[in-house]
Interface confidence: low
């Protein structure tokens, strides 16, 4: 039975040209995290594997930084970065947990962070 929950940074916004940290946190489970995938729509951005460490997709190597923790830092944001991001936790023995973050990249300097929310 999957008892865990994923807490994410929820709906967030950031300025064009700036940077943002995407973070998820898995709680309420004793399952071992073997790998975390970060995906944008259906595109793989990065992997953090418990044994192998971080791998950033070649498309994003110049502007995606691993961390902090299992999170991901997006740099030099453009309006094209607006959209859904998913953290996919592969765990043993529970299986897969998925969290969703919606990022809006704004032209203006007004970029307020949305509240945290949980995805069961």
């Amino acid at each position: 039975m999957m008892t865990g929950t994923i807490e994410t940074t929820g709906n967030i916004s950031a300025e064009k040209g700036g940077s943002i940290i995407l973070q998820c946190h898995l709680s309420s489970t004793t399952a071992q995290v073997t790998q975390v995938n970060w995906e944008q729509q259906d595109q793989l951005l990065a992997i953090c594997n418990a044994d192998l460490g971080w791998h950033i997709s070649p498309s994003f190597k110049d502007r995606v930084a691993p961390g902090p923790g299992l999170g991901l830092t997006l740099q030099s944001l453009t309006v094209n970065d607006t959209g859904e991001y998913f953290c996919i936790y592969h765990t043993y023995p529970d299986g897969t947990y998925t969290g969703r973050i919606f990022l809006e990249v704004l032209e203006s300097s007004v970029a307020e962070h949305g509240a945290r929310f949980q995805i069961p």
Epitope: Q41, D42, Q43, L44, N49, L52, S57, P58, S59, K61
Partner: antibody
Framework: EVQLVQSGAEVKKPGESLKISCKGS????????IGWVRQMPGKGLEWMGI????????IYSPSFQGQVTISVDKSVTTAYLQWSSLKASDTAMYYC??????????WGRGTLVTVSS | LPVLTQPPSASGTPGQRVTISCSGS????????VNWYQQLPGTAPKLLIY???QRPSGVPDRFSGSTSGTSASLAISGLQSEDEADYYC???????????FGGGTKLTVL
């Protein structure tokens, strides 16, 4: 089982066009870049370029930029390598490979291309 | 010319330990991990070592990799006749934004 199945050997004349294929199976095709590598007879491995199956973004080696075109059709989980006008110097074995952690971890068996008049 | 430099040949007798070197620069081996490939005669290359020293499942622990600065090396201990093959080092190059190979080392088991 993860596999990259390449199209068969080709014999062409100089100036002809050619498109060879590499079909991925047994895994989520869009989660891995596909690369192409050339090996001329008796020589070493040369990286030609890679493609992201999600959005067809390509990165070419400067040596092959403008000489070949790499493309993908994710609906049939297949990557392609094509020439518009072959030269005798294109005679080689061409391999496709799947990337994971910046390593070419799964390879096709190769397609032998022979260009001769 | 290959961006990474390997000796063209190496040899050893069965049971011996053989090391193959691979020299690069700050934009490749100096800042990225190294992979090694084995190409047996008449076959496609096969990943032997990735991320400097990791072995894919099925690769014997006789094969090991290491790096130091802008150089890498592949060590094969307890050499066997079936190890006779071409060995290539490879690393991502930040200036090229793509991978670069060594010229390959032909290993002969005497």
């Amino acid at each position: 089982e993860v596999q990259l199945v390449q199209s068969g050997a080709e014999v062409k004349k100089p100036g002809e066009s050619l498109k060879i294929s590499c079909k991925g199976s047994g895994y989520s095709f869009t989660n891995y870049w596909i690369g192409w590598v050339r090996q001329m007879p008796g020589k070493g491995l040369e990286w030609m370029g890679i493609i992201n199956p999600v959005n067809s973004r390509t990165i070419y080696s400067p040596s092959f930029q403008g000489q070949v075109t790499i493309s993908v059709d994710k609906s049939v989980t297949t990557a392609y390598l094509q020439w518009s006008s072959l030269k005798a110097s294109d005679t080689a074995m061409y391999y496709c490979a799947r990337y994971y952690y910046y390593a070419m971890e799964v390879w096709g068996r190769g397609t032998l291309v022979t260009v001769s008049s | 010319l290959p961006v990474l430099t390997q000796p063209p040949s190496a040899s050893g007798t069965p049971g011996q330990r053989v090391t193959i070197s691979c020299s690069g620069s700050s934009s490749n081996i100096g800042s990225n991990t190294v992979n090694w490939y084995q190409q047996l005669p008449g076959t496609a290359p096969k990943l032997l070592i990735y991320r400097n020293n990791q072995r894919p499942s099925g690769v014997p622990d006789r094969f090991s990799g290491s790096t130091s600065g802008t150089s890498a090396s592949l060590a094969i201990s307890g050499l066997q006749s079936e190890d006779e093959a071409d060995y290539y080092c490879e690393a991502w190059d930040d200036s090229l934004n793509g991978p670069v190979f060594g010229g390959g080392t032909k290993l002969t088991v005497l």
